[in-house]
């Protein structure tokens, strides 16, 4: 991964921080919830982009070229957004315009386009969508997105938040 | 992997109350969703009730909503369908079955072996 511009810390960290708040809103849990417990089995690896230890997030690897891991949260956020765009959530029941998810899926969309490098081709993946015997499944599927999202937030969040902390060149004065 | 032993069909008069039971061993700490399933004589299997592992969000067939109602206990790692105002049309073997994947799908991978509920007119 080329070396290239850095973000704007900042405002990585607060449009990921409203990202999080955004989340739980849109699927607040019945009782206590921790975020999701990851099984590591393959099928599940390859399905859902995760932030690993060899992503290169942590403080050291940010340090060294942050470009790794924020290719590796460009990844996880089209991710999420294809999901969010598809007919798991326009079909029944139908969102409300400026609900909380239509809140998330235009904030995702902001942070994607400000961590997207201008020649960043845009990736296509096959649009998810349920028969007529499926139906039953799209609250579910919905819970299980979102609860994904949450996790896969929690961690960005922290990322851009330490970024902002200690990557943020300082304003220089000038005479 | 999770096994499922079902339990509390039986015959019952319509308009009547019967609990379904369903003991979870194995794998309990993968559970992701747990759900009640039905199959009526010459019919599909079909989807009656669900319930999230961590957190307790539930989720209803339109034909069961405020007639069922899907609870577990992790403790003793139990769901239990409570089941009012039964209907002849109720009648079906009732299936526990779990989706233990994180992944973005849905999947009821492990089934009891069902129990049987017969609603009488």
């Known amino acids: 991964v080329p070396r290239s511009s850095s973000p704007d810390w900042a405002q990585c960290q607060q449009l990921s921080r409203n990202l999080c708040m955004l989340a739980w809103n849109a699927h607040a849990p019945a009782g206590h919830m921790n975020l999701l417990r990851e099984e590591e089995d393959e099928e599940t690896k390859n399905n859902v982009p995760r932030i690993q230890c060899e992503d290169g997030c942590d403080p050291q690897g940010l340090k060294d070229n942050s470009q790794f891991c924020l290719q590796r949260i460009r990844q996880g956020l089209a991710f999420y957004k294809h999901l969010l765009d598809s007919d798991i959530f326009k079909g029944e029941p139908a969102l409300l315009p400026d609900s909380p998810m239509e809140q998330l899926h235009t904030s995702l969309l902001g942070l994607s386009q400000l961590l997207q490098p201008e020649d960043h081709p845009r990736e296509t993946q096959q649009m998810p969508s349920l028969s007529s015997s499926q139906q039953w499944q799209r609250p579910l599927l919905r819970s299980k997105i979102l609860r994904s999202l949450q996790a896969f937030l929690a961690i960005a969040a922290r990322v851009f938040a330490h970024g902002a902390a200690t990557l943020t060149e300082p304003l220089v004065p000038t005479a | 992997e999770v096994q499922l032993v079902e339990s509390g069909g039986g015959l019952v008069q319509a308009g009547g109350s019967l609990r379904l039971s369903c003991a979870a061993s194995?794998?309990?700490?993968?559970?992701?969703?747990m759900g009640w399933f039905r199959q009526a004589p010459g019919k599909e299997r079909e989807f009656v009730a669900a319930?999230?592992?961590?957190?307790?969000?539930?989720y209803y067939a339109d034909s069961v909503k405020g007639r069922f109602t899907i609870s577990r206990d992790n403790a003793k790692n139990t769901v239990y369908l409570q089941m009012n105002s039964l209907k002849p049309e109720d009648t079906a073997v009732y299936y526990c079955?779990?989706?233990?994947?994180?992944?973005?799908?849905?999947?009821?991978?492990?089934w009891g072996q069902g129990t049987q509920v017969t609603v009488s007119s």
């Open positions: 194995g794998r309990t700490f993968s559970i992701y969703y």
């Open positions: 079955a779990v989706d233990d994947r994180t992944n973005m799908s849905v999947d009821f991978g492990s």
């Open positions: 319930i999230t592992w961590i957190g307790g969000d539930t």
